[in-house]
Amino acid sequence: KSSNEATNITPKHNMKAFLDELKAENIKKFLYNFTQIPHLAGTEQNFQLAKQIQSQWKEFGLDSVELAHYDVLLSYPNKTHPNYISIINEDGNEIFNTSLFEPPPPGYENVSDIVPPFSAFSPQGMPEGDLVYVNYARTEDFFKLERDMKINCSGKIVIARYGKVFRGNKVKNAQLAGAKGVILYSDPADYFAPGVKSYPDGWNLPGGGVQRGNILNLNGAGDPLTPGYPANEYAYRRGIAEAVGLPSIPVHPIGYYDAQKLLEKMGGSAPPDSSWRGSLKVPYNVGPGFTGNFSTQKVKMHIHSTNEVTRIYNVIGTLRGAVEPDRYVILGGHRDSWVFGGIDPQSGAAVVHEIVRSFGTLKKEGWRPRRTILFASWDAEEFGLLGSTEWAEENSRLLQERGVAYINADSSIEGNYTLRVDCTPLMYSLVHNLTKELKSPDEGFEGKSLYESWTKKSPSPEFSGMPRISKLGSGNDFEVFFQRLGIASGRARYTKNWETNKFSGYPLYHSVYETYELVEKFYDPMFKYHLTVAQVRGGMVFELANSIVLPFDCRDYAVVLRKYADKIYSISMKHPQEMKTYSVSFDSLFSAVKNFTEIASKFSERLQDFDKSNPIVLRMMNDQLMFLERAFIDPLGLPDRPFYRHVIYAPSSHNKYAGESFPGIYDALFDIESKVDPSKAWGEVKRQIYVAAFTVQAAAETLSEVA
């Protein structure tokens, strides 16, 4: 049998049959169905949608579909006591107030339960004080403010523009700088593409549009009250003071009309350089405080949101494997949205729905995958990846023994320019081979493969003739599977041609204007990009679940390990004197990577030569491949981040969305020149090199001949 041929049935039921069954029209229909009302986590509407999906997945033919519920900490605005920000004069009178809600889009004026813009998990508070503009509130922005400009944010309210990094990192940075409140806003420079109209006439953000989002710093913990364990009916919950990752200062988001009113009065220091200026007609002065005429005016925040333990529901569907039912390939994406979820998440949920339908059709015709496929509709992703994390905590023992791969399925589109893939190196060859077999949906690439259009539009910076594949970071439901459990993971979506704004999202992200019409009118009228993403995600799942030998190439890990070792070594070599003084050597890491390379090469040769008709040897080789990702897990986790346990990859400590390689070494080296005790700091670098070298060597040995 060919590797993608189905199990125990006639050859017509192969990958092609699965892909041919996927229909753009169905994805469109499902998206419409999922986006007519809000599906905020913890609400009745989202519970009803969970039950609908459960029912439909059963109809599609899955063997079983269950709801898995958890009681987790969520956050909501106070319905009778709205959140807002004001400018107050010296008498304390409010002379300007920010808007209490977004103007609803046409056709949605009478929809109830649209949650107003808020920063989820903000504590309550009414701080008042002078404003300091902190650009994107990145680590380097605060370095610029504090070290170069000598501006002290202590006791100030900071205003930061959305974009570049995860909003939770912005809030953490502001807290560490001593701020007493944070205002987040969307600047047109980041959320208004030139030459495009604002919604409803185009896909740009209108001035009254606001990005919602959580501001936690969970570092992979899941429910803040039950870190490490499922939030089930007998859970022990921490007190709110001991909860993981909650912000300590009030935070609130606003649109650029309101931001204009705050920023136009700013005085104090001029912006340090052009990179601190957005596109509003304001000076982008840093402050602190307002300029001359307005210097007695202050900014006051009014935040009354509450944190509540609330029930959430995952939908878990099972398609049992015919040959290896104890090996799980998981396709998961979230269902909860901030409002309508036109892109996030329902463009992804609609694709998952169609993938389930296609698999179900094949199953009804007598087919089964070789391995078990689990389908998941996660809840409360927007509140900190809670549904996926709680389920993984509850099932961790099964997952760590049986988990082959996890494919994420949040938003299918964030643009319509080209494919974007982030995955473990183990999946590089799978992605390459699959995209070579799929047709490109791009204009100008008719009759060409997806691989060709993708490589042309998004070439790898390192490897000639290959497309860019990025490292996995976080900010989505793969986190627990990859960063905590070490299950090979990947994600794919269509993206924009906007490399400089990689982490800013699309303009209407998390706003009320993220509707079905946004997608149908402006992003993908024919749903051809959605169909392509369904083919990529579904094709990956099909091949992972059905190929006789797992489609993982360990040699690709060897290539990136050497690249990452070079990168971290070059960072360290910016301090040659200290490396000499403290006897810092990377030889152990280089040696471990070389050993990994040689062993991976030999393993690959054995993989090509072994007798695939011997089920014991086949299972043994597949287990070595499955457990390779697991071998990069350090049970002790990273320093101060116990749930980030992958030694090769972790979310950046400065931006949760971005992946960092050799994160333990990277963090130990970061800003090392400013450490008060250099001997201790360089000692930690040496320890992290040791941990990394040991882990790479240990992983290599899992690929050695077993006896």
Epitope: A558, S570, F586, K594, S601
Partner: antibody, heavy 122, light 111 residues
Framework: EVQLVESGGGLVKPGGSLRLSCAAS????????MNWVRQAPGKGLEWVSS????????YYADSVKGRFTISRDSAKNSLYLQMNSLRAEDTAVYYC???????????????WGQGTTVTVSS | SSELTQPPSVSGAPGQRVTISCAGS?????????VHWYQQLPGTAPKLLIY???NRLSGVPERFSGSKSGTSASLAITGLQAEDGADYYC???????????FGTGTKVTVL
């Protein structure tokens, strides 16, 4: 016997093209990284390009990037170098060489062909 | 321009010991990349002598040995023989260039 035999060299005008071939025998060609290395008259060795066993990792020297294309056909046990926009400074003996493993950055080149001469001149 | 520097020539009488140095940088030899040594007799293709810093290819006489330390490497020929007269090249990988790098080459003359 392990052997590499280059062919396709010759005299070409500046701006012209040539395609070099390298026929491999005596080893499992599909398992090894392969390279092109050149040597200008009276000069030292200069690495030109490298391709791994499954043609996914391809590298070029900066001096030939965008002009030369390396490829391989494992079914034919052959390595190729398509050279376009040739310049006078590309004049050299071109060697095909096998790497000891599938990772060009670790291993030495243990098998070399006899070389084929490329002369770029008007 | 090569990233690995070798002396243009070394010479010695038969039976003598000669060493050829190969000076690299922190992005090649100093970054843990192996050094390999090649011998090129006049009018012939290069031949691998030493791989992985210190390992002799089978069939290479024991009088050839390699070593590596820090950002440099060296090839020693003990008991020099007439047939050792040739050009010798070191080779490594440079991570900043993402490419193989050869040394400038050393001509060994047997007096």
């Amino acid at each position: 016997e392990v052997q590499l035999v280059e062919s396709g060299g010759g005299l070409v005008k500046p701006g012209g093209s040539l395609r070099l071939s390298c026929a491999a025998s005596g080893f499992t060609f599909s398992r090894y990284n392969m390279n092109w290395v050149r040597q200008a008259p009276g000069k030292g060795l200069e690495w030109v390009s490298s391709i791994n066993s499954n043609s996914r990792y391809i590298y070029y020297a900066d001096s030939v990037k965008g002009r030369f294309t390396i490829s391989r056909d494992s079914a034919k046990n052959s390595l190729y170098l398509q050279m376009n926009s040739l310049r006078a400074e590309d004049t050299a003996v071109y060697y095909c060489a096998k790497t000891m493993g599938d990772y060009y950055y670790y291993y030495g080149m243990d098998v070399w062909g006899q070389g084929t001469t490329v002369t770029v001149s008007s | 321009s090569s990233e690995l520097t070798q002396p243009p020539s070394v010479s010695g009488a038969p039976g003598q010991r000669v060493t050829i140095s190969c000076a690299g940088s922190l992005s090649n030899i100093g970054a843990g990349y192996d050094v390999h040594w090649y011998q090129q007799l006049p009018g012939t293709a290069p031949k691998l002598l030493i791989y992985g810093n210190i390992n002799r290819l089978s069939g290479v006489p024991e009088r050839f040995s390699g070593s590596k330390s820090g950002t440099s490497a060296s090839l020693a020929i003990t008991g020099l023989q007439a047939e050792d007269g040739a050009d010798y090249y070191c080779q490594s990988y440079d991570s900043s260039l993402s490419s193989y790098v050869f040394g400038t080459g050393t001509k060994v003359t047997v007096l």
